[in-house]
């Protein structure tokens, strides 16, 4: 990548990107550009949209000049009877621009959802659907009683009118968050993921957390009482420290784990919460990772096969997460 030249941006102001298109730094970290979308040509200077799981596929290693924005392997989405590839954007109606990301669809409104506050020149604003127009528009009604203007003007909320608090921008956002996926490992440290647009700019992003359904070294079957077939949530005698890539959790945790059954059922997390865990590494570095903590487990026959790509929906999803 040739970033030796001095940074020179086409315009000093950040460009205005179409709905659903991310504003990103170019590959040299110089200029903010509108990210290229699925199937579009890309270069090191014109990167693909990372928020949609896209990467610039240059084909042969020899060619590092121009590529095509390609989706990292991710689950497709079925929406309104159509199938969309992960990373693909589409307009679900004239009002919404949607994106598929790893099986989940997130949409941003194309119509302004701005709050029109009462003002002296428009004391009674009202949204109406105009013929031939997709989006509703504001109209101003004349007050029947001129004395009503005063109280109407007092109705504004400070946060709505004074600044760019992104949580107010989110009024334009259809917040969607998938359930956490099942832990990637049935024992030991694994990863659980979800897709959400519950963030500052309503962008679809993939979140991950560490998870441990049960320790691998625990022989839980011998704890099953006579006459019982399952141990749903075995008691772990002592607090544990978690290990991750040679790093150890700073604190000890009296964590709950899921048990096992002897009748072919499997026990998986049912209600969970997500908490930050600090890990200290041998070189002294401290890293903070979100981790799943189990509240309750459920034992059931919906067990995933080792190579079953159509894992049961029950198993794939984590219900009742508190965070």
């Amino acid at each position: 990548q040739d970033c030796s030249a001095q940074c020179q941006c086409a315009a000093e102001a950040a460009p205005h990107c179409p709905a659903g298109v991310s504003l990103v730094l170019d590959g040299c970290g110089c200029c903010r550009v509108c990210a290229k979308q699925l199937g579009e040509l890309c270069t090191e200077r014109d990167p693909c949209d990372p928020h949609k799981g896209l990467f610039c596929d240059f084909g042969s290693p020899a060619n590092r000049k121009i590529g095509v924005c390609t989706a990292k392997d991710g689950a497709p989405c079925v929406f309104g009877g159509s199938v969309y590839r992960s990373g693909e954007s589409f307009q679900s109606s004239c009002k919404y621009q949607c994106t598929c990301l790893d099986g989940a669809v997130g949409c941003v409104p194309l119509c302004s959802m701005d709050v029109r506050l009462p003002s002296p020149d428009c004391p009674f604003p009202r949204r109406v659907k105009l013929p031939g127009k997709c989006c509703e528009e504001w109209v101003c009604d004349e007050p029947k009683d001129r004395t009503a203007v005063g109280p109407a003007l007092a109705a504004y909320r400070l946060e709505d009118t004074f600044g760019p608090d992104p949580t107010m921008m989110r009024a334009n956002c259809l917040v969607q968050t998938t359930e956490w996926s099942a832990c990637s490992k049935t024992c030991g440290m694994g990863i659980s993921t979800r897709v959400t647009n519950d963030n500052t700019f309503c962008r679809l992003e993939k979140q991950s957390r560490l998870c441990m359904v049960r320790p691998c070294e625990a022989d839980l079957e011998e704890n099953i009482k006579k006459g019982k077939k399952c141990i749903r949530t075995p008691k772990i005698a002592k607090p544990v420290k978690f290990e991750l890539s040679g790093c150890t959790s700073v604190k000890t945790y009296r964590a709950k784990f899921c048990g096992v059954c002897t009748d072919g059922r499997c026990c998986t997390p049912h209600r969970t919460t997500t908490l930050p865990v600090e890990f200290k590494c041998p070189d002294g570095e401290i890293m903070k990772k979100n981790m799943m903590f189990i509240k309750t487990c459920a034992c059931h026959y919906n067990c995933p096969g080792d190579n079953d790509i159509f894992e049961s929906l029950y198993y794939r999803k984590m219900y009742g997460d508190m965070a």
């Epitope: 950040a14 400070l158 946060e159 004074f162 600044g163 760019p164 608090d165 949580t167």
Partner: antibody, heavy 114, light 110 residues
Framework: EVTLKESGPVLVKPTETLTLTCTVS????????VHWIRQPPGKGLEWLGV???????DYNAAFMSRLTISKDTSKSQVVFTMTNMDPVDTATYYC????????WGQGTTVTVSS | ESVVTQPPSVSGAPGQRVTISCRSS?????????ANWVQQLPGTAFKGLIG???NRAPGVPDRFSGSKSGTSASLAITGLQAEDEADYYC?????????FGGGTKLTVLG
């Protein structure tokens, strides 16, 4: 009555970390964000960063690698941390409420010197 | 990098109208810049006057008003009073950060 009050050390050595606390009253940190601004002696204002009411943060790019802003809503406190302080960071540091910067703290003067 | 420019000083006689400009170096000032105006009275703390281009903060008299046009935002003060003598700062929001202007000293003559 809305008030904001900055507290923290008045003297910091070069390379040390500055930690300031903004304690607010008369409003909730879950309703309003809080900005940090500084004013070097005899100069104008410089915006440093903000923690929004929902906990998100935005920082001045020039200080991104050195700045952390966090909050404890239950204690009505916002904590501002700036690492690797330098004599050029000598200034009066203010916290101000989001919403037109309508209310400000009285400021705390921080001197960076060995 | 965005630069916000204000005149170093303006002056006016009591009762007059003065305006202070706030120019953005990177093009038109829009409602998305949420132009803010802040007052610093001599020897006292700061106080917000205007937010979101033209919205007065609670308790601010209607002699103070904010507007925008082209590449500038403006603060207008009508019926100038001796107690308006202060430093005035504007701040513009650029997608991820605010930038303050250099400040304008307002002198009330007489």
């Amino acid at each position: 009555e809305v008030t904001l009050k900055e507290s923290g050390p008045v003297l910091v050595k070069p390379t040390e970390t500055l930690t300031l606390t903004c304690t607010v009253s008369g409003f909730s940190l879950s309703t309003f964000g809080v900005h940090w601004i500084r004013q070097p002696p005899g100069k104008g204002l410089e915006w440093l960063g903000v923690i929004w009411r929902r906990g998100g943060t935005d920082y001045n790019a020039a200080f991104m690698s050195r700045l952390t802003i966090s909050k404890d809503t239950s204690k009505s406190q916002v904590v501002f941390t700036m690492t690797n302080m330098d004599p050029v960071d000598t200034a009066t540091y203010y916290c101000a409420r989001d919403g037109g910067f309508d209310y400000w703290g009285q400021g705390t003067t921080v001197t960076v010197s060995s | 990098e965005s630069v916000v420019t204000q005149p170093p000083s303006v002056s006016g006689a009591p009762g007059q109208r003065v305006t202070i400009s706030c120019r953005s170096s990177i093009g038109a000032v829009t409602t998305s810049n949420y132009a803010n105006w802040v007052q610093q009275l001599p020897g006292t703390a700061f106080k917000g006057l205007i937010g979101g281009t033209s919205n007065r903060a609670p308790g601010v008299p209607d002699r103070f008003s904010g507007s925008k046009s082209g590449t500038s935002a403006s603060l207008a003060i009508t019926g100038l009073q001796a107690e308006d003598e202060a430093d005035y700062y504007c701040a513009l929001w650029y997608s991820t950060h605010y930038v303050f202007g250099g400040g304008t000293k307002l002198t009330v003559l007489g």
